[in-house]
């Protein structure tokens, strides 16, 4: 019979409930936004906000210094009375809706939920390594400020994003705010503006340019500002908002909104929708052609991508690329198919196909009925007019007005649905080498860091660890710090590796020394680890070949048993080729002679299961005793493979010797026509591979084997007469001498 | 006593290069941002150059763009002011003054006693 | 660049008299303004910031007023040190610009 090795699930060779603690920070309460700083000089800095409080930290993450930023009103408050004497405002508790880095000054601005949602400047002062915050400027300036026109008031106690971008000689906030009708009747925070931080830090620089959703579409039409970031000639905005103005508010789509962050205007302000679907490889009955929409980003992130997944997505190599997790619905449940999905737009594909909308919009013939779009920011308007207008006068462009593209921008879940059931709450890409790594965090608390390929049916992950026992959601907000990344979860700040924790999730050489260069990880006896945690033992270059099974488990002591190994490490080259005298095996004291590979017999194995298996010729030597006794490979002057080299021995013990006994045949007599049943009784007749019944010379077709008893049909005999019977064993004759009569049918 | 001294003034011909120092002290030099503002004799004020606290972020009149770079020594207490190409126009006293720290305003509520530059054939 | 523009280039008074100083941005700078007073082989010393705000151990005889483009300094009652010349400085984006000055002089 042809015994297959049994095949290891890929996920058996680690193991994602390994513990890593990784430092980290209890800042006091749930923290509401977190940003790094790296100075030129080797000072850096952790700022964490909390209700009432911004923490400053080391690189090592001990508190350096704190500040109250709250309770407004109250005199204990650090930022409000940079103010000079209040009242300012309410009194009440500051939520930090922002917490930005002025890379020009560089100084940290922080924005709160009170005092009409104004901003702090906190100068940086570099101290050692470490960097402290100066008193706080309050960028309010009371005399330019009411309350339907206050370019002071940044932040909206619903959320805003802010991006600061140097101008010539000047800093510009980008800043978008969601809101709704209560939070636009109380100082007039803007959807979208640009304001200019004054030269002498006592607030914006009035008359800034803005869009704000209608005061008509304020209570059903709401916008949430899911991330933004400069990259280019541009700074952009990704939106979570109803897919239109006047259909149901709960049908929600994704929105890239794109301004230029060369001049401070909003005329060139464009929107395109990103749609990200689930496609899997074989479409089920009913499923959406195309695939499964998944419309509503959760988080995003932008960075340049490694050389695979570059030459993946057909761009080049650090090109800058938007990634995007997305899940179907605000509650994230899906129907079928995966929790979230994750969808790459290389950013120049953007950029072309907002371009490209502009010149259908603009450049005749236009297209009739083609919408300007945006009615929740302008007046209606059919392109190439401008809102609210019947046509385009001599003195306007149609390209100095905000245009919503046509056309959607559409991708498919880069992992193919491998995500599952994880819900992903968090996201930060880097090249590490010529890899591209995504960051998650979830929804119960793990960091995932997976390579972002997408032509595997499987995940390639760099680490899969819980972040904390509290099992709380991972925050949007991610942060670098050197070679490190800042997690948020509850009220705690973790400093995840971007080369991943640590290799001891990893439990077999094989996995560890394939594991990615930048992971540092090296195989210490027996296990994996980084070096640091293993010194005496630590190596990268080779591993032992591993048995893990092996079949048959016993064979006669006289002839031959065929001898399948299985385990890893017996190769490294797919086709399994073994160069002379590298393998050796030895049964007890018996020599197993390798086989050549069956090429007919060759399987593809995908990478989701691995076994290797090695087959040889076992002749016991003389010396050999009856009895149990170690099967053990040894592997030596390998070349190398790609990753390492197989050098060392592996030992598996359970083989047994025996020496099969035939004790009874019957019938003794038969047809000459053949077909008789024979019962050969003994001991030991299943031992080894191979095994023959001969009557007269020719097989006996064996109908059913076991450890007792054998069964044949005879075949049939020339004449009528008396037979030699034999039973063979690994090709050795079994003791007995037995005949057969072949009588006239 | 916050003081501020310039020093480095003098006859340099067209085209040829000085370098302006103003020692600080009486104050923590690192928290401030400084600038230098030059007055030609029997003229107004121009204002010349800025600098972050940190050093981090400088800014130049049009005037002297390309030609003066503006740095500081937080660890020496020192402001400088390095003027190459330097033409008849940039005769002038400089000042080096003290701006509040960010939390106030960017005015210069401290001023050395200034320093002549003279650039003549 | 923002222009600043003074007047009177000068002006002639007697002590006790009121004083007004015009200084005018070429576009809006809010508030962001200040005032300064320097005597003939003197550095520049500063009196009003923020447009209006009294810089330390400033005499009240001296105020500012104004917002966005126009703004004034006011020497209520002159006093004899007070014949100098006066400067705005705009504060609102770089490059920061002086005015001409306004030379107070005695009748």
């Known amino acids: 019979e042809d015994w297959q090795c049994p095949r290891t699930p890929y996920a058996a060779s680690r193991d994602f409930d390994v513990k890593y603690v990784v430092p980290s920070f209890s800042a006091g309460g749930l923290v509401q936004a977190m940003v790094t700083y790296e100075g030129d000089r080797n000072e850096s800095a952790v700022f964490v906000a909390i209700r009432n409080r911004l923490h400053v930290l080391g690189p090592d993450l001990k508190s350096v210094q704190s500040l109250a930023t709250g309770p407004a009103g109250d005199p204990g408050c650090q930022t409000c009375a940079a103010c000079g004497p209040g009242p300012h405002g309410p009194p009440g508790d500051t939520d930090t809706k922002v917490l930005v880095l002025d890379p020009a000054l560089p100084a940290l601005v922080s924005c709160g939920s009170s005092l009409q949602g104004r901003c702090f400047l906190h100068d940086l002062e570099p101290q050692g390594t470490a960097v402290h915050l100066a008193a706080p400027a309050c960028l309010f300036s009371a005399h330019h400020n009411r309350p339907d026109d206050c370019p002071d008031c940044v932040a909206s106690p619903l959320g805003t994003r802010v991006t600061v971008v140097e101008q010539g000689q000047a800093s510009y906030f980008y800043v978008a705010s969601s809101l709704d009708a209560a939070v636009a009747a109380s100082f007039s925070p803007r959807s979208v503006s640009i304001r200019r931080l004054k030269a002498d830090a006592s607030g914006f620089a009035p008359g800034f340019v803005a869009l704000s959703v209608l005061p008509k579409h304020l209570v059903s039409y709401s916008i949430e500002y899911v991330h933004s970031f400069h990259t280019g000639a541009f700074v952009y905005f990704l939106t979570v908002q109803p897919a239109s103005v006047t259909d149901d508010p709960s049908a929600l789509h994704t929105r890239l909104a794109r301004l230029s962050a060369t001049e401070p205007e909003l005329g060139d302000y464009r929107e395109l929708v990103l749609d990200c679907r689930f496609a899997p490889k074989r479409r089920r009955r009913g499923a959406p052609e195309g695939g499964q929409p998944y419309p509503v980003l959760r988080v995003a992130h932008s960075a340049p991508v490694g050389a695979q997944l570059a030459t993946e997505l057909s761009i080049a190599e650090g090109q800058e690329v938007l990634f995007g997790v997305f899940v179907t619905g605000k509650d994230g449940g899906p129907g079928v198919g995966p929790n979230s999905v994750v969808c790459a737009f290389p950013i120049d594909l953007l950029d072309t196909l907002i371009d490209e909308g502009v010149e259908r919009c603009c450049e005749s013939p236009v297209h009739p009925g083609l919408r300007r779009g945006l009615d929740f920011f302008q007046s209606p308007s059919f392109c190439p007019n401008p809102p609210g207008l019947e046509a385009l006068s001599p003195n306007t462009s149609c390209r100095h007005f905000p245009l919503l593209v046509s056309s959607s921008f559409s991708r498919v879940d880069l992992f193919n649905g491998l995500l599952g059931p994880v819900q992903v709450t968090a996201l930060y890409v880097t090249r590490l080498d010529n890899v591209t790594v995504a960051h998650m965090g979830t929804m119960d608390g793990r960091i995932l860091q997976v390579e972002l390929v997408r032509s595997l049916n499987y995940l390639l992950y760099v680490s899969n660890f819980s972040l904390g026992d509290s099992g709380q959601p991972v925050q949007r907000d991610v942060s670098r710090l050197g070679d490190h990344l800042l997690f948020a979860s509850g009220d705690q700040v973790f400093q995840v590796p971007i080369q991943g924790p640590g290799c001891r999730h990893f439990l077999t050489c094989g996995r560890c020394l394939r594991a990615w260069h930048f992971m540092g990880c090296g195989w210490c006896g027996n296990m994996c680890g980084q070096q640091k945690e293993c010194p005496g033992s630590w190596q990268q270059d080779h591993c032992p070949p591993k048995l893990t099974e092996f079949h048959p488990h016993s064979g006669p002591l006289r002839g031959s048993t065929r001898l399948t190994l299985c385990g890893s490490n017996f190769y490294l080259h797919p086709s399994g080729l073994v160069p002379e005298g590298t393998h050796q095996v030895t049964v007890g004291q018996s020599p197993c002679r390798p086989l050549p590979k069956d090429s007919s017999k060759l399987r593809p194995v995908p990478r989701k299961d691995f076994v290797e298996e090695f087959e040889c010729e076992l002749e016991p030597l003389g010396t050999q005793a009856v009895g149990p006794t170690n099967v053990s490979l040894t592997v030596t002057n390998m070349p190398p493979g790609k990753h390492f080299r197989v050098d060392g021995t592996s030992v598996l013990r359970g083989f047994s010797f025996m020496e099969p006994v035939l004790i009874a045949v019957q019938p003794l007599f038969g047809p000459r026509a053949g077909g008789t049943c024979l019962t050969l009784e003994g001991q030991s007749l299943s031992v080894g591979t191979s095994r023959a019944v001969l009557v007269n010379g020719t097989e006996c077709l064996l109908a059913r084997v076991s450890e007792g008893q054998l069964l044949c049909a005879t075949p049939p005999g020339a004449t009528v007469a008396s037979v030699p019977l034999s039973l063979q064993v690994g090709g050795a004759q079994v003791p007995g001498s037995w005949t057969f009569q072949y009588r006239e049918d | 006593e916050v003081q501020l001294l310039e020093s480095g003034g003098g006859l340099v011909q067209p085209g040829g290069s000085l370098r302006l120092s103003c020692a600080a002290s009486g104050f923590t030099f690192s928290d401030y941002q400084m600038e230098w503002v030059r007055q030609a004799p029997g003229k107004g004020l121009e204002w010349v150059s800025y600098i972050y606290s940190s050093g981090g972020k400088t800014v130049y009149a049009d005037s002297v763009k390309g030609r003066f770079t503006i740095s500081r020594d937080n660890s020496k207490n020192t402001l400088y002011l390095q003027m190459n190409s330097l033409r008849a126009e940039d005769t002038a006293v400089y000042y080096c003054a003290r701006l509040p720290r960010v939390g106030a305003t960017i005015i210069n509520d401290y001023w050395g006693q200034g320093t002549l530059v003279t650039v003549s054939s | 660049d923002i222009q600043m523009t003074q007047s009177p280039s000068s002006v002639s008074a007697s002590v006790g008299d009121r004083v007004t100083i015009t200084c005018r941005a070429s576009?809006?700078?809010?508030?962001?303004l200040a005032w300064y007073q320097q005597k003939p082989g003197r550095a520049p010393k500063l009196l009003i910031y923020a447009a209006s705000s009294f810089h330390t151990g400033v005499p009240s005889r001296f105020s500012g007023s104004g917002s966005v483009t126009e703004f004034t300094l006011t020497i209520s009652s002159l006093q004899p040190e007070d014949f100098a010349t006066y400067y705005c400085?705009?504060?609102?984006?770089?490059?920061?610009?002086f005015g001409g000055g306004t030379k107070v002089e005695i009748k």
């Open positions: 576009r809006g700078i809010s508030s962001s």
């Open positions: 400085q705009q504060t609102d984006s770089f490059p920061l610009t």
